[in-house]
């Protein structure tokens, strides 16, 4: 058993049929010695008396809010949550496996630049009695500070018969050094509590590996005289790190016909303009990627050819 | 060439070669690293590689103030990785397929380090740890880790030379 926060405790249980469970001793936080009784949740049934209560925690029915009273007055509470371990593996019932980029990916994170700011998100099908708390650091043995906000519900989607809820959190490294080569990864830890079930999820990454620039901005076409060619131009996204002579992007320009089956013409360039042939009913799209490190491409910015 | 005593390197040449290094490092190992290393003896094997750290003056302001600190750090790293790529980790078994880009990568690391330091001038270099695995397949794990960290190192070096070519070239 360990303390998650004040008056909230997590009991770690090996979860199998007829498991013996864990013996837990609760102590009433009071100077009083006599006349103390214990109850669980809303029940008025007295579970025991005395300053301490010893219980055998085996299942969710044994978890909940234990309260000690004296003469009708509440003295203190202890909330017990359960953390299940099945076949040596901690349960992952609360969050959905996003399976990208690999199986058992529960947390996904992205950064728009090298400033040390990043966003993580996760999915669940649970809609109520759900709380999350997020902690982060750079490195684990001698951790350096990363500050995370509160996790918020950022999207709801319908998937078949199920509703899916996306939560996200923003974090900022306290003393980020955008130009340095990271040697210690960022660690993100999410505590998830659903009713009386506790789970924790972790992710470890370098900012450089989760970079995904915003799409290029101000995408414009300029027809070239007496030609089917056009000059496409664009600018670095506002959110990208500066100076651009140091934090450079490379770009992919694509001409795509109306039909998905039509052949795509692609040009790669380090410049912020390119000359392409504009076909009727086609669209021109541009996306960006770090020039020197192959992290994710941005989403496409697009304009119609006409 | 970088000349002892703090004069400028050939920024544009260094820019071109460092960008080529980035391309080669990614062609040698294109994955962004989703190999399952958990069941391999994942002891920390590449913690001793030289990293370009915050105080090394490789940020735009530091380069403007005095690029020599940063160039020396880059040079140290290039020599370190050049030695690693020429070591038993990459030459031992399992041997690399004949068309492996590691040979080119090795030569380019040497080429860029020579651009930064002409004959007769010596910056101190870091000792490379002797990592000769007793199990042949462990070399794959070491290669994986070395190339992942080389990709990060050459990305910073390429940014330095691109910025230098754009803002510090005579």
């Amino acid at each position: 058993i360990w303390e998650l926060k004040k008056d909230v405790y997590v009991v770690e249980l090996d979860w199998y049929p007829d498991a013996p469970g864990e013996m837990v001793v609760l102590t009433c936080d009071t100077p009083e010695e006599d006349g103390i009784t214990w109850t669980l949740d809303q029940s008025s049934e007295v579970l025991g008396s005395g300053k301490t209560l010893t219980i055998q925690v085996k299942e969710f029915g044994d978890a909940g809010q234990y309260t000690c009273h004296k003469g009708g007055e509440v003295l203190s509470h202890s909330l017990l949550l359960l953390h299940k371990k099945e076949d040596g593996i901690w349960s992952t019932d609360i969050l959905k496996d996003q399976k990208e980029p690999k199986n058992k990916t529960f947390l996904r994170c992205e950064a728009k630049n090298y400033s040390g700011r990043f966003t993580c998100w996760w999915l669940t099908t649970i809609s109520t009695d759900l709380t999350f708390s997020v902690k982060s650091s750079r490195g684990s043995s001698d951790p350096q500070g990363v500050t995370c906000g509160a996790a918020t519900l950022s999207a709801e989607r319908v998937r078949g018969d199920n509703k899916e809820y996306e939560y996200s959190v923003e974090c900022q490294e306290d003393s980020a050094c955008p130009a340095a080569e990271e040697s210690l990864p960022i660690e993100v830890m999410v505590d998830a509590v659903h009713k009386l079930k506790y789970e924790n999820y972790t992710s470890s990454f370098f900012i450089r590996d989760i970079i995904k620039p915003d799409p290029p901005k101000n995408l414009q076409l300029k027809p070239l005289k007496n030609s089917r060619q056009v000059e496409v131009s664009w600018e670095y996204p506002d959110t990208w790190s500066t100076p651009h002579s140091y934090f450079s992007l490379t770009f992919c320009v694509q001409v795509q016909g109306k039909s998905k089956r039509e052949k795509k013409d692609r040009v790669f360039t380090d410049k912020t303009s390119a000359t392409v042939i504009c076909r009727k009913n086609a669209s021109i799209s541009v996306r960006a990627q770090d020039r020197y490190y192959s992290s994710s491409w941005s989403e496409w910015a697009s304009v119609p050819c006409s | 060439r970088a000349v002892p005593g703090g004069s400028s390197p050939a920024w544009t040449q260094c820019q071109q070669l460092s960008q080529k290094l980035c391309t080669l490092a990614w062609s040698a190992h294109p994955l962004v690293g989703h190999m399952d290393l958990r069941e391999e003896g994942d002891e920390e094997t590449t913690n001793d590689v030289p990293h370009i750290q915050c105080g090394d003056g490789c940020d735009p302001q530091g380069l403007r103030d005095n690029s020599q600190f940063c160039l020396q750090r880059i040079h140290q790293g290039l020599i370190f990785y050049e030695k690693l790529l020429g070591s038993d980790i990459f030459t031992g078994e399992p041997s690399l397929l004949p068309d492996s880009p590691v040979g080119q990568l090795h030569a380019s690391l040497l080429g860029l380090s020579q651009l930064l330091q002409p004959e007769g001038h010596h910056w101190e270099t870091q000792q490379i740890p002797s990592l000769s695995p007793s199990q042949p397949w462990q070399r794959l794990l070491l290669r994986f880790k070395i190339l992942r960290s080389l990709q990060a190192f050459v990305a910073v070096a390429a940014r330095v030379f691109a910025h230098g070519a754009a803002t510090l070239s005579p």
């Epitope: - | 040698a28 190992h29 994955l31 190999m35 399952d36 290393l37 958990r38 069941e39 391999e40 038993d88 030459t91 031992g92 078994e93 399992p94 041997s95 690399l96 397929l97 492996s100 880009p101 590691v102 007793s134 199990q135 042949p136 397949w137 794959l140 794990l141 290669r143 994986f144 190339l147």
Partner: antibody
């Protein structure tokens, strides 16, 4: 064509040593390894060790605790396996085999003992 | 050392029937969680062994009645329709860790 030709059968006394040779032809000797495998009469195969002339790396089966020495002479494309302190249980056919062991930079690719010598019967008897 | 245990020791199968040979490793012989460093060799009487499966992939020229499967610690070589020329002893070999180790062999005969 690729050939591995081993030296002839040997009868040895307990406590003595034997040195079996394996002459390779038909390929670039230093581009491959040589593996030594033995097979006692009516028994299975036992890996003794492997030598890669290009890198100079040699891998041994510790079971033989310093009794086995594997060498290669690049000038004559010949590999050797010497086994000392012979005992009766060392009576076996000793094979050399060409080892091809390659990978992409970071991924397993191929390991094959693709060509074998004809075998050398070593009999240890007093 | 990784111990490779083959079963059965011998197997008598009618011509055209299926033969299944098992090989169990005392610990995982997977590399990076995906590729199995496991190989199958066929040895006919009076001959040196011949490679038929390498890193769980068939060698070229091996008839497609042979198939290899398994991962981690448990592997199987199957001959879907036994032919007279398949009579031999079959060995599995792991090369995940030095010393590389062979299984004890499975003798396949015609019933």
């Amino acid at each position: 064509q690729v050939q591995l030709v081993q030296s002839g059968a040997e009868v040895k006394k307990p406590g003595s040593s034997v040195k079996v040779s394996c002459k390779a032809s038909g390929y670039t000797f230093t581009s491959y390894g040589i593996t030594w495998v033995r097979q006692a009469p009516g028994q299975g195969l036992e890996w003794m060790g492997e030598n890669y002339p290009r890198s100079g790396n040699i891998y041994y089966n510790e079971k033989f605790k310093g009794r086995v020495t594997i060498t290669a002479d690049k000038s004559t494309s010949t590999a050797y396996m010497e086994l000392s302190s012979l005992r009766s249980e060392d009576t076996a056919v000793y094979y050399c085999a060409r080892a091809e062991f390659i990978s992409t930079v970071v991924a397993p690719y191929y390991y094959a003992l693709d060509y074998w010598g004809q075998g050398t019967l070593v009999t240890v008897s007093s | 050392d990784i111990v490779m245990t083959q079963s059965p020791d011998s197997l008598a199968v009618s011509l055209g029937e299926r033969a299944t040979i098992n090989c169990k490793a005392s610990k995982k012989v997977t590399i990076f969680g995906s590729t199995s460093a496991l190989h199958w060799y066929q040895q006919k009487p009076g001959q040196p062994p011949k490679l038929i499966y390498n890193l769980a992939k068939p060698e070229s020229g091996v008839p497609d009645r042979f198939s290899g499967s398994g991962s981690g610690t448990d592997f199987t070589l199957t001959i879907s329709s036994l032919q007279a020329e398949d009579v031999a002893v079959y060995y599995c070999l792991q090369n995940k860790e030095v010393p590389y180790t062979f299984g004890g062999g499975t003798k396949v005969e015609i019933k």
